[in-house]
């Protein structure tokens, strides 16, 4: 499929001008190659009319130009003084005409309306309102006022001052007679339909002295705005329908066959299943405008989209609308990354998030898509050291591996973590990607204790058991804080026997904290990685308590019946206000959350020396300050 994209249909009137924009992937080759506009012949050839290399056909001399905008990946063909002879099938393209790097455009130039003298022309958008003004003389002030529409040869009454309304206009038309001072009546038609277009006649009085005024109503179907986005990327449709529909239900629909327009999302809570997890309808402004963000663009998302306002939340005749033609470029700059990541309950996932590598300094974000209302995406973590309170100790955003990818690790998974998550930055809004996390049955691969309590001034050793499947991976322990997970020294204690059918390649790796202090309290992760690519992690919360006075009973003794694998997680989570992605501009403008970065530092860890009586009287304590 050609990656070149432009308008499928262009309509104009004799004597007018058109401006045709064609899009191409802005690779360095494409930016500098020849651009052309050619007319397709009956036998399949395509005759160049104008090109970026300076050629202009005699047919276009003095009335056309072609301008390349390499930074945008677009070129524009302007044609003036149109005649009906210009109607036909054209191509805009790159390279040589026959190569197929092109897009087909149909240009239709119609004859201007043959208007009667003294005809007032009203040009109004579909779904909007028109007011037709009808002047009259004093002698007709008390006489019947009426508006007719010319259907074929015959005028058909639309409305009159005696109360008649044509059934085609019921509920959307009124006749206003101005105060006595003004010799004018007006007819207001709302929710204009394409079928309302045509010649109208307004009349005051019915005899030979009646006053008459001709009006020509042109109802414009909105020209679709062309939108060219990359596969796997994101698109935002900004819909501004005007304050008069501020309180009417809004919708975005996608045109299917014929005139059908299938609702993608609306403010009444409807959402098409194909867009689950990857769409947000952002709240309306006071003027009734709103926007819809779609991420994780697929080939099949290409097509014509309409936004509109109607009490039913879907397209009806007379809905004011805006239109877009979306082209999804399959030669995407956004790299492939898994759209579904599976994790075992109790274990972890590591999600790779792409971003525009030109924006390495941008702030990275990860949010959880929620389908309630019109969809929202409350922020969970960012690269500035903010982590939503409920996720402390189990969520980390790492800048690694860098160069266009960051990593998000979420551990201690439960079924409640299943859902759709968005990767995004405060930079290029096109680089928003979606990943679905699915929770599956199974056992975590890494085995760690449940709740761990250290004693002030003593040494703590926490084991992490790695199965053979991770024999080629780097194994690590780190201390979690809101800016990441700081690596700690750890010791390989040899093979682990924690796994059935696992040979000497399984490992037991210990974290050792010597001379424990209060600063050592917190979440510790053990995990595996290969270079800068992270694998599974397991989390342990280390509480720190005072050393007990001699003879006092150790509370841990009372836990004699606890299951050996039981995980007791800290449930003292603080509730804080959601930070939600509701407006795609949010990140460019503000980040209204206090920086809760953990300033505590001073965790001590050591590699165990392995002496048989290290803690039994010897003074060999190793301190590692971070």
């Amino acid at each position: 499929k050609s990656p070149i994209f432009g308008p499928e249909e262009v309509n104009s009137v004799e004597g007018n001008s058109v401006s045709i924009t064609c899009y191409y992937p802005p690779t360095s080759v494409n930016r500098h190659t020849r651009k052309y506009w050619c007319r397709q012949g009956a036998r399949g050839g395509c005759i160049t009319l104008i090109s970026s290399e300076g050629y202009v056909s005699s047919k276009y001399a003095g009335r056309a130009n072609l301008t390349n905008f390499p930074e945008n990946g677009t070129f524009v063909v302007n044609i003036a003084q149109l005649s009906q002879d210009d109607s036909g099938r054209y191509k805009c393209g790159l390279g040589i005409n026959s190569r197929g790097l092109s897009f087909d455009v149909s240009l239709e130039v119609s004859q201007g309306p043959g208007l009667l003298n003294d005809t007032k022309v009203y040009t109004v958008d579909l779904g909007r309102t028109v007011t037709i003004n009808c002047p009259f003389k004093t002698e007709n002030a008390q006489k019947r006022k009426s508006l007719y529409k010319q259907i074929g040869l015959y005028p058909v009454l639309v409305i009159d001052s005696s109360g008649y309304v044509n059934p085609n206009y019921t509920g959307r038309i009124r006749l206003d007679i101005q105060g006595t001072g003004q010799l004018l009546f007006s007819v207001v038609i709302n929710q204009l339909r394409l079928s309302d277009a045509g010649q109208y006649l307004c009349q005051a009085g019915d005899d030979s002295n009646s006053n008459k005024k001709n009006a020509d109503l042109q109802v414009l179907k909105p020209e679709p705005e062309l939108v060219y986005e990359d596969l796997r990327g994101s698109v935002t449709f900004h819909c501004a329908l005007g304050p008069e529909v501020a309180n009417v239900a809004k919708f975005l629909c996608r045109q299917s066959s014929g005139e059908n327009c299938d609702v993608v999302v609306n403010t009444l809570g409807k959402r098409a299943p194909a867009f689950e997890g990857r769409i947000l309808l952002n709240p309306q402004d006071k003027d009734g405008s709103f926007s819809v963000v779609i991420t994780g663009l697929r080939k099949e998302d290409a097509g014509r989209y309409l936004c509109g306002a109607h009490s039913d939340g879907q397209l009806q005749e007379g809905s004011p609308i805006q239109a877009w033609q979306l082209f999804v470029n399959e030669e995407s700059t956004i790299p492939r990354s898994p759209t579904v990541v599976k994790g075992v309950a109790g274990s972890s996932v590591a999600v790779l998030c792409p971003y525009n590598r030109k924006e390495s300094k941008s702030i990275k974000y990860w949010c959880l898509w929620e389908g309630a209302q019109n969809g929202r995406c409350p922020l969970l973590v960012d690269s500035e050291g903010w982590v939503k309170a409920q996720y402390e100790g189990r969520l980390s955003l790492l800048e690694e591996p860098g160069n266009g990818t960051f990593t998000v690790i979420l551990n201690q998974l439960t079924s409640r973590d299943a859902g759709f998550y968005w990767c995004l930055t405060n930079g290029d809004t096109l680089w928003r990607t979606t990943v679905e996390i699915k929770i599956i049955e199974g056992e975590p691969n890494l085995k760690v204790p449940g709740n761990v309590t250290a004693v002030l001034g003593e040494t703590l050793k926490v084991p992490c058991h790695f199965p053979c499947k991770f024999s080629s991976y780097e194994k690590y322990w780190c201390k979690w804080n809101n800016t990441g997970c700081q690596a700690l020294p750890s010791q390989d204690e040899g093979p682990s026997k924690a796994f059935v059918n696992c040979d000497e390649n399984s490992r037991l790796v210990s974290l050792t904290l010597n001379l424990v202090t209060r600063a050592d309290e917190g979440w510790y992760w053990c995990g595996v990685k290969q270079g800068h690519f992270y694998g599974e992690t397991a989390a342990v919360y280390v509480a720190v308590e005072e050393r007990k006075a001699a003879g006092s009973r150790d509370v841990s003794l009372a836990k004699a019946d606890a299951a050996p694998d039981e995980k007791v997680l800290d449930s003292g989570f603080r509730e804080i206000e959601n930070k939600a992605i509701q407006d795609p501009r949010l990140f460019a403008e503000e980040k209204a959350v206090a920086d809760t970065r953990d300033q505590a530092d001073g965790s001590r860890a050591s590699v165990d020396s392995g002496s048989s009586e290290e803690q039994g009287g010897s003074s060999r304590h190793h301190h590692h300050h971070h």
Partner: nanobody, 125 residues
């Protein structure tokens, strides 16, 4: 469930030696995933910590009252932990308990989660 069974207790003279063993079975995880410890309880007194050992035997910790006289070791191949007691004193008379934990910490507050039934050691003067 983890079952811990102690053996080796008995009656000895002051100054003698004795070796206690603890065998683990029915584990949810293998033996070398547990730190192990010995505790004791003398008649009319609270249970007290004696010694502990990390999951691979790399580190140990002893109560001051037994330091230099008792040695704790483990054999992960046989799923056993041993307490070698030398220079026994009448004050060492107690029921000795074996315990396991999912992690190890130095000090007398061993985080035990499973216990054996105990074996009686009597030291006569």
């Amino acid at each position: 469930q983890v079952q811990l069974v102690e053996s080796g207790g008995g009656l000895v003279q002051a100054g003698d030696s004795l070796r206690l063993s603890c065998a683990a079975s029915g584990r949810a995880l293998s033996f070398n995933t547990y730190a192990m410890a010995w505790f004791r309880q003398a008649p009319g007194k609270e249970r007290e910590f004696v010694a502990s050992i990390t999951y691979n035997g790399g580190s140990t910790y002893y109560a001051d009252s037994v330091k230099g006289r008792f040695t704790v070791t483990r054999d992960n191949g046989k799923d056993t932990v041993t307490l070698r007691m030398n220079s026994l004193k009448p004050d060492d008379t107690a029921v000795y308990y074996c315990a396991s934990a999912q992690y190890w910490r130095s000090g007398t507050s061993f985080p035990a989660n499973y216990w054996g039934q105990g074996t009686l050691v009597t030291v006569s003067s």
